[in-house]
């Protein structure tokens, strides 16, 4: 065997956040040489399931007819070809909603806010919870907050927004969860419409600060370094300057790459140029273009090795929520606090989209824009204008990871750097 087999792609349809009782299909896509596909679930020593490949042998289907707590968790898949087992896929996090009663979402002082002023979204649960999550509907890239408070149980979490701009306007929902299983979420709250009025326009919303829960004076919002949080205005400018610097650097790099690309292009075919253009810098060979997750090698996207990119699409808000989540939490300190730090980054889209593992029919009927989501996972530039993406950095996810015996190709292989990818779709 010349080298390790490429890792397969793992995804869930209709998404990876599923309401209790609903069906979900997990797909694992490998190569045409695959003879068997295996799905492993974290904490499960035996292979969770195995299936023959479906013709033309490049993928397998694992069906869950009715979502329950037992199915929520972290999955990886492998395939076996004549030369052995593949590398593991990137993890798929299957999340179940409906595990707890829905929280209440409100806006303080009011859901009607003047541009430039401050507003705080308050997510309250009837029973004490330690994790709260906020999503925004009808936004390509919403703010997403996740916070665990020292294991302490809280009845509410605050999501401050300052200064508010027109971009903050829209419909929000929140979820609550217990820290012992981040794969089990409450029912979604009723939607809250945030209406922004006034003429003070800001071209881009400021990153929302770390979530704090109402718990007394010692309960300060955590920053990555443990430093005291800056004032909203100072932090706003710091982030804007940071974004500007990063944008300039990226633009310089892009111009350099384009120049180099143009100079080399005279001696290449169009196909070769496109293949090169889509290859992440430093990569020896292209990642499989099968709609899978690719490692981000962009400095703008890699924030201390752990990313959380969130994207929301809306179809029918009244039907519940589905969220496509892929995440590799660190296993450093199970007692550590999970918090969110939001950063702005501007990944550009690639010119040629990879083949989608989702059927055309699914894309049409569900309006998931799956191609667009996957294209965001690349570094290649496109002619269109860059689009803002909010990255939230999650540190020391409070999940213990139990090692399971890997297939033979895994011996001596160093695990890939953890990455997080989430796509939220409201259903």
């Amino acid at each position: 065997q010349a080298g390790p087999l490429p890792k397969p792609t793992l995804w869930a349809e209709p998404g990876s956040v599923i309401s209790w009782g609903n069906s979900v299909t997990i797909w694992c896509q490998g190569t045409l040489e695959a003879r068997e596909y295996r799905l492993d679930k974290e904490e499960s020593p035996a292979p969770w399931d195995r299936q023959n490949p479906l013709e033309p042998k490049n993928k397998a289907r694992f069906s869950i007819p009715s979502m329950t707590e037992d199915y929520a968790g972290r999955y990886r898949c492998y395939y076996r070809s004549p030369v052995g087992w593949s590398q593991p896929s990137d993890p798929l996090e299957l999340v179940m909603t409906g595990a707890y009663s829905k929280p209440t979402l409100s806006a303080l002082p009011s859901p009607l806010v003047t541009s430039g002023k401050s507003v705080t979204l308050l997510c309250q649960s009837r029973s004490p919870m330690d994790t709260f999550l906020l999503i925004k509907e009808r936004a390509a890239h919403p703010l997403l907050h996740l916070r665990s408070e020292h294991g302490a149980q809280q009845h509410q979490a605050e999501f401050p927004m300052s200064p508010v701009t027109s971009v903050h306007g829209g419909t929000y929902r929140c979820f609550s969860s217990h820290g012992f299983s981040h794969y089990l979420l409450s029912h979604p709250s009723d939607p809250l419409e945030l209406i922004v009025s006034g003429s003070l326009e800001d071209p881009r919303p400021s990153p929302t600060r770390s979530v704090s829960t109402a718990a007394g004076p010692e309960d300060q919002p955590l920053m990555p370094t443990g430093s005291v949080p800056h004032s909203g205005l100072r932090r706003h400018w710091e982030v804007l300057i940071g974004v500007l610097v990063v944008s300039i650097l990226l633009l310089s790099l892009l111009l350099f790459l384009l120049l180099q690309h143009w100079r080399q292009g005279k001696h290449r075919t169009l196909a070769q140029r496109q293949a090169d253009f889509q290859r992440p810098p430093g990569a020896a060979e292209p990642e499989p273009k099968d709609g899978g997750l690719q490692r981000r090698s962009s400095p703008a996207a890699d924030v201390q090795g752990e990313n959380f990119c969130a994207a929301v699409k809306n179809t029918q808000p009244e039907d519940g929520v589905e969220m496509d989540t892929r995440q590799s939490p660190h296993d450093e300190d199970p007692q550590a606090v999970t918090y969110a730090k939001v950063k702005h980054s501007r990944p550009r889209r690639e010119m040629a989209s990879p083949p989608s593992p989702l059927s055309g029919e699914f894309l049409d009927t569900k309006d998931r824009q799956a191609e667009e989501d996957r294209q965001m996972d690349t570094e290649a530039a496109a002619s269109e204008a860059p689009q803002d993406v909010t990255y939230a950095q999650l540190h020391s996810f409070t999940l213990r990871q139990k090692a399971t015996e890997p297939p033979p190709s895994q011996e001596g292989a160093s695990p890939a750097e953890p990455s997080v990818y989430a796509t939220l779709a409201i259903h």
Epitope: A46, P47, Q51, P82, V83, W85, E405, P406, P408, Q410
Partner: antibody
Framework: QVQLQESGAELVKPGASVKLSCKAS????????MHWVKQRPGQGLEWIGE????????NYNEKFKTKATLTVDKSSSTAYMQLSSLTSEDSAVYYC?????????????????WGQGTSVTVSS | DIVMTQSPSSLSASLGDRVTISCRAS??????LNWYQQKPDGTVKLLIY???RLHSGVPSRFSGSGSGTDYSLTISNLEQEDIATYFC?????????FGGGTKLEIK
């Protein structure tokens, strides 16, 4: 040591159903899949299906999809196979067998331990 | 399904003999071949997995070889306790399938 204790011989009438059991001991029941294999008198072995005791996931041989139903009871570390609408073709010895990874970090899987077999005779 | 053809269906040999049993698959099974021994009382044991790997507790006189579609089991020094029926089984694709068996007797 690993042991798979199967239930006793069964004499059943055509059209009836029978439920065979296989009690596992000497290992962690949920760490290994359980397979079921059929052997007709003087003939070879036929794979019926498999079940993952930890989550109840099953895979069946197409030939036995409507014939056999595999279940487990984790609390008693017991696997079950129900055979329905029995005919004389179902008269056979049925084995349960443990399937799992062999060798440390090798990634090779096989049925490594078998029960003693349960004889099922279908006769009116 | 992959068809496994075993030969011979039966054979007689003397104690101390070297015995070889063959197994052919209807398609390439990439070395995912196991050998089982079934004693006259019905007890079944795994002997060899993945073509040539000896299962724990199996005497070293048993060995396996092969690749692609052709595989074999060899008993280098036949002993009385080896009297049994031997089955090959492919584990390359679901469903697993078995050969028809080779019944080994003492002359």
């Amino acid at each position: 040591q690993v042991q798979l204790q199967e239930s006793g011989a069964e004499l059943v009438k055509p059209g009836a159903s029978v439920k065979l059991s296989c009690k596992a001991s000497g290992y962690t029941f949920t760490n290994y899949w359980m397979h079921w294999v059929k052997q007709r008198p003087g003939q070879g072995l036929e794979w019926i299906g498999e079940i993952n005791p930890s989550n109840g996931r099953t895979n069946y041989n197409e030939k036995f999809k409507t014939k056999a139903t595999l279940t487990v009871d984790k609390s008693s570390s017991t696997a079950y196979m129900q055979l329905s609408s029995l005919t004389s073709e179902d008269s056979a010895v049925y084995y349960c067998a443990r399937w799992g990874q062999l060798g440390l970090r090798e990634g090779y899987y096989a049925v490594d331990y078998w029960g003693q077999g349960t004889s099922v005779t279908v006769s009116s | 399904d992959i068809v496994m053809t075993q030969s011979p269906s039966s054979l007689s040999a003397s104690l101390g003999d070297r015995v070889t049993i063959s197994c052919r698959a209807s398609q390439d099974i990439s070395n995912y071949l196991n050998w089982y021994q079934q004693k006259p009382d019905g007890t079944v044991k795994l002997l060899i997995y993945y073509t040539s790997r000896l299962h724990s507790g199996v005497p070293s006189r048993f060995s396996g070889s092969g690749s692609g579609t052709d595989y074999s089991l060899t008993i280098s020094n036949l002993e009385q306790e080896d009297i049994a029926t031997y089955f090959c089984q492919q584990g390359n694709t679901l469903p697993p399938t078995f050969g028809g068996g080779t019944k080994l007797e003492i002359k």
